[in-house]
């Protein structure tokens, strides 16, 4: 095959090699970019910046090598369009630093940075951590910081992500109130900060205020839906990102719902209770307090993380006709109380007769177990918990 005269030449089925001295100053408009899985670039001293737009359209790229070139700067979002990138070799360039954001979101198996005039500062704390943790083949490179020494020796005591403190109101918050939250950000080299409010939806009207180092957030006209919803403050510096989530408790009165009893492993009278703070519960049976036992007890389902409503069952272990009746669930919190009732019938009464009527007794003369003409008692597996006096 004739030698390829272009700046970049195909290599294998989905690779491209760009090795002609000084032919590139950017990676725009590479031929066949959308199908490339491998890109090898060498001796491109004019290629000094790698930015978001350079790798747009290279969605299949897995291996990127830019070596012995003039690369001085890689943008934090440079690899946004190459999520499949697993090997990145940027050795023997002019890189002094590389942001933690550049590799965030990638699953790099290999990151090669040797031969760059790296400069040690907190901005390389993430890379030092990779070295400590044996990630990406970094330890084998024994990276040096230009003018200083091994990256491994860089002091890191002051290299922390931002510290966040979110102040929430101490006082009780009621439906319809306006709530002011403040996020205090501390730390060196603060770059960006903000709020994540994706869970809030229609729970309140949101107004943001202020900026670093103190961010304000007003939640106006809050609803009870705000409960259990995360309000997250985040901040970034050259070391990394920190997030702190808080929840605002909006007080509202207890409410309760009961549903028809269903037979499962045990019988279950399903219920739902809501309220903030969480209401206390009490069951009544036919108007009297029901004391729970190992046969009759309240069981809650696993609560949903983002809502106050609790679902559960009054569990009844093999109930009989004596458990038939009216069940009432009382729920109360400081802001109100509620109740709901339901009739439950688990079993017909096998002794449904008038006490004045004669009691029918069956004799079984063929029963060999019976040594006399006494009535044979058939023991039912279900304990009735009731005694019948025969007069």
């Amino acid at each position: 095959a004739a030698p390829c005269p272009d700046a970049c030449c195909p290599h294998g089925s989905s690779g491209l090699r760009c090795t002609r001295d000084g032919a590139l100053d950017s990676l725009h408009h590479l031929p066949g970019a959308e199908n490339l899985t491998e890109l090898y670039i060498e001796n491109q001293q004019h290629l000094q910046h790698l930015e978001l737009r350079d790798l747009r359209g290279l969605g299949e790229l897995r291996n990127l090598t830019i070596v012995k070139s003039g690369l001085r700067f890689v943008a934090p979002d440079a690899f946004h369009f190459t999520p499949r990138l697993s090997r990145l070799n940027l050795s023997f360039n002019a890189l002094e630093s590389l942001s933690w954001k550049t590799v965030q979101g990638l699953s790099l198996q290999e990151l090669v940075l040797s031969g760059n005039p790296l400069h040690c500062s907190c901005a390389l704390r993430w890379l030092q951590r990779w070295e400590e943790e044996g990630l990406g083949g970094v330890p084998e490179q024994k990276l040096q910081c230009h003018g200083q020494g091994p990256l491994a020796h860089m002091p890191n005591a002051s290299c922390g992500v931002p510290t966040l403190k979110v102040q929430v109101p101490n006082a009780s918050v009621d439906v319809g109130d306006d709530v002011l939250l403040r996020c205090q950000v501390e730390g060196r080299g603060l770059e960006q900060a903000g709020w994540i409010l994706t869970e809030l939806e229609q729970s309140a009207t949101v107004m943001k205020s202020g900026g670093l180092p103190s961010l304000g957030l007003t939640l106006a006209n809050v609803t009870s839906d705000l409960n259990r919803k995360n309000v997250t403050c985040w901040a970034e510096n050259d070391v990394g990102r920190a997030e702190v989530s808080v929840q605002v408790n909006v007080s509202f009165p207890a409410s309760v719902q009961l549903h028809t009893a269903v037979e499962m492993h045990h019988w279950c009278i399903p219920f739902s209770v809501d309220g903030q703070p969480a209401p206390s519960l009490r069951w009544l049976f036919n108007g009297s307090v029901l004391n729970e036992t190992s046969f009759i007890f309240t069981e809650f389902l696993e609560p949903a993380a983002n809502e106050t409503v609790r679902h559960g069952c009054l569990r009844l272990n093999q109930p009989t006709h004596v458990n038939n009746g009216n069940y009432t669930l009382l729920a109360a919190n400081p802001f109100g109380q509620a109740s709901a009732s339901i009739m439950a019938a688990f079993m017909d009464n096998p002794f449904e007769f008038n006490p004045e009527d004669p009691i029918p007794v069956s004799f079984s003369p063929v029963d060999t177990n019976s040594t006399s003409g006494d009535p044979v008692e058939k023991k039912d597996e279900t304990p009735f918990g009731v005694s019948v006096a025969v007069g």
């Epitope: 500062s121 040096q144 230009h146 003018g147 020494g149 020796h153 860089m154 510096n237």
Partner: antibody, heavy 119, light 106 residues
Framework: QVQLVQSGAEVKKPGASVKVSCKAS????????MHWVRQAPGQGLEWIGT????????SYAQKFQGRVTLTRDTSTSTAYMELSSLRSEDTAVYYC????????????WGQGTTVTVSS | DIQMTQSPSSLSASVGDRVTITCRAS?????LYWFQQKPGKAPKPLIY???SLGSGVPSRFSGSGSGTDYTLTISSLQPEDFATYYC?????????FGGGTKVEIK
Amino acid sequence: QVQLVQSGAEVKKPGASVKVSCKASGYTFTEYWMHWVRQAPGQGLEWIGTIYPGNSDTSYAQKFQGRVTLTRDTSTSTAYMELSSLRSEDTAVYYCTRFYFEDWYFDVWGQGTTVTVSS
Amino acid sequence: DIQMTQSPSSLSASVGDRVTITCRASSSISWLYWFQQKPGKAPKPLIYYTSSLGSGVPSRFSGSGSGTDYTLTISSLQPEDFATYYCQQWHSYPPTFGGGTKVEIK
């Protein structure tokens, strides 16, 4: 103990060059970056550049790029700083200093070499 | 380049006084160094990465700060402490020094 001993004072004419030496002892010369810093009379400290004796890697301050050359001789554990096209404002005391990576600072300094540029 | 601004540029104090020198960086830095220099001598390292005492440095010297604002404190000034003090950053190339603070006898 660790020591850096510099060459003696120099008087030069404008346009000439000067080469200052810095002999290291008491440690492995090739393992630590050597830096050069200068101080004009009555002024503050100004960084010139650095060399890694292990492989001759260098970095220079933008201001001195093209005029300064840092070299080393590992056989004698000596670092050199050569400054060309001298002008009167290059009159200063020139220091070599080792960057001690174990504690991450310039821990040992030479005694200084006075370079006077005068016609 | 990151600019380092020291204040005051000079101060007069008596033996036993508590002395505070501040250094402000033009942008946030990772850590700071302090040097002491006496006339005709090379700078002597006092404090490295912000608050660690250099070898043989008396405990009356202390350093603190973060971000852009840093402080060198001498808790009880001694006769041998009369000198010029320099701060230095190396968060990014090139390393830069403050203009110096001369501590003189009152």
